[in-house]
């Protein structure tokens, strides 16, 4: 009886089970009752990453420097090229097809997590007792200066954007 289902790494064609081509190879011709599936290695700059019956290999992704991209990992016959972004930029999507400049955290906000090639800067509001007076992609919220430890007193209260201003204690005459 002709098979209706085939084993893993096989496919059904013309009432018979043929072997799939291994990763890195494409299908040239289906198997017959006399010959096995004929496969050929993918060419330079091509790949196939699964057991397959594809007649064409896929082109490696191009990391376009005009879009801020660079090669993170060179592709092989079995894997695609992995792109990442130039320093100071990050991918706009998981596929990393283009890059955007890392965002800066405005005054009043500090960097919670520094950006990577694939994720943007994560900012957080400076809580009470902390401030940030710059727009930065690296600076965290800084704690207010402790006037007491300097034997000074607070002359001007701090905000989320400014540090406290310390001054000398009033002396009793």
């Amino acid at each position: 009886e002709p098979p209706t289902a085939c084993r893993e790494k096989q496919y059904l064609i013309n009432s018979q089970c043929c072997s799939l081509c291994q990763p890195g190879q494409k299908l040239v011709s289906d198997c017959t009752e006399f010959t096995e599936t004929e496969c050929l290695p993918c060419g330079e700059s091509e790949f196939l990453d699964t057991w397959n019956r594809e007649t064409h290999c896929h082109q490696h992704k191009y990391c376009d420097p005009n879009l801020g991209l660079r090669v993170q990992q060179k592709g092989t016959s079995e894997t695609d090229t992995i792109c990442t972004c130039e320093e100071g930029w990050h991918c706009t999507s998981e596929a990393c097809e283009s890059c955007v400049l890392h965002r800066s955290c405005s005054p009043g906000f500090g960097v919670k997590q520094i950006a990577t090639g694939v994720s943007d800067t994560i900012c957080e509001p400076c809580p009470v007792g902390f401030f940030s007076n710059v727009s930065s992609a690296f600076e965290k919220c800084h704690p207010w200066t402790s006037c007491e430890t300097k034997d000074l007193v607070v002359q001007q209260a701090g905000t989320n954007k400014t540090d406290v201003v310390c001054g000398p204690q009033d002396r009793l005459r």
Partner: antibody
Framework: EVQLVESGGGVVQPGRSLRLSCAAS????????MSWVRQAPGKGLEWVAS????????YYPDNVKGRCTISRDNSKNTLYLQMNSLRAEDTAVYYC??????????WGQGTLVTVSS | EIVLTQSPATLSLSPGERATLSCRAS??????LHWYQQKPGQSPRLLIN???QSISGIPARFSGSGSGTDFTLTISSLEPEDFAVYFC?????????FGQGTKVEIK
């Protein structure tokens, strides 16, 4: 028991034709691809033709394409090889073989074809 | 066309000795190779398929190995009935091709 019995061989003049037959028994003939393989005296094996189980697909090497035709009659459990424009280099023992697991798992006893003037 | 080259052409050994026959393909054929034995005046018979798979009814002293372009048929201990000609055959692609054969003869 699987049996393949070839017939139709003999002495034939160059340029003439010959039809070989192979009577199959002991298995379901219509489920198997079949092939012809030849062997010139004192030489190695050479594939001549193959035909799929249903008879729809045929395969030939370039050196016999156009001169040889493989066919089958599943109702008669018989395989054929029609050879035309025979040449001295076609002189050989012709074997009928069954394709099992993509191998030639059973062979007939062979029939000798001699092309000579 | 895939060319199969068998070596040596002739192997002279004594019964009980180990025989190692080689078959080399002109390009990679994965494990798509069979081995056949032919005794004088007889038809060939299948010994090994898919380079290393044993065939029912064939003595265990016959074994095959290899993949890609280099294949080996080993007869672990020669019996008198093993002196014959051995052919490899590829079924990776059309046309089907055979090696020219290795004759194992009594020394």
């Amino acid at each position: 028991e699987v049996q393949l019995v070839e017939s139709g061989g003999g002495v034939v003049q160059p340029g003439r034709s010959l039809r070989l037959s192979c009577a199959a028994s002991g298995f379901t003939f219509s489920n198997y691809g079949m092939s012809w393989v030849r062997q010139a005296p004192g030489k190695g094996l050479e594939w001549v033709a193959s035909i799929s189980s249903g008879g729809d697909d045929t395969y030939y090497p370039d050196n016999v394409k156009g001169r040889c035709t493989i066919s089958r009659d599943n109702s008669k459990n018989t395989l054929y090889l029609q050879m035309n424009s025979l040449r001295a280099e076609d002189t050989a023992v012709y074997y009928c073989t069954r394709a099992g697991g993509k191998a030639m798992d059973y062979w007939g006893q062979g029939t000798l074809v001699t092309v000579s003037s | 066309e895939i060319v199969l080259t068998q070596s040596p052409a002739t192997l002279s050994l004594s019964p009980g000795e180990r025989a190692t026959l080689s078959c080399r393909a002109s390009q990679s054929i994965r494990d798509n190779l069979h081995w056949y034995q032919q005794k004088p005046g007889q038809s060939p018979r299948l010994l090994i398929n898919y380079a290393s798979q044993s065939i029912s009814g064939i003595p265990a002293r016959f074994s095959g190995s290899g993949s890609g372009t280099d294949f080996t048929l080993t007869i672990s201990s020669l019996e008198p009935e093993d002196f014959a000609v051995y052919f490899c055959q590829q079924f990776n692609s059309w046309p089907l091709t055979f090696g020219q054969g290795t004759k194992v003869e009594i020394k």
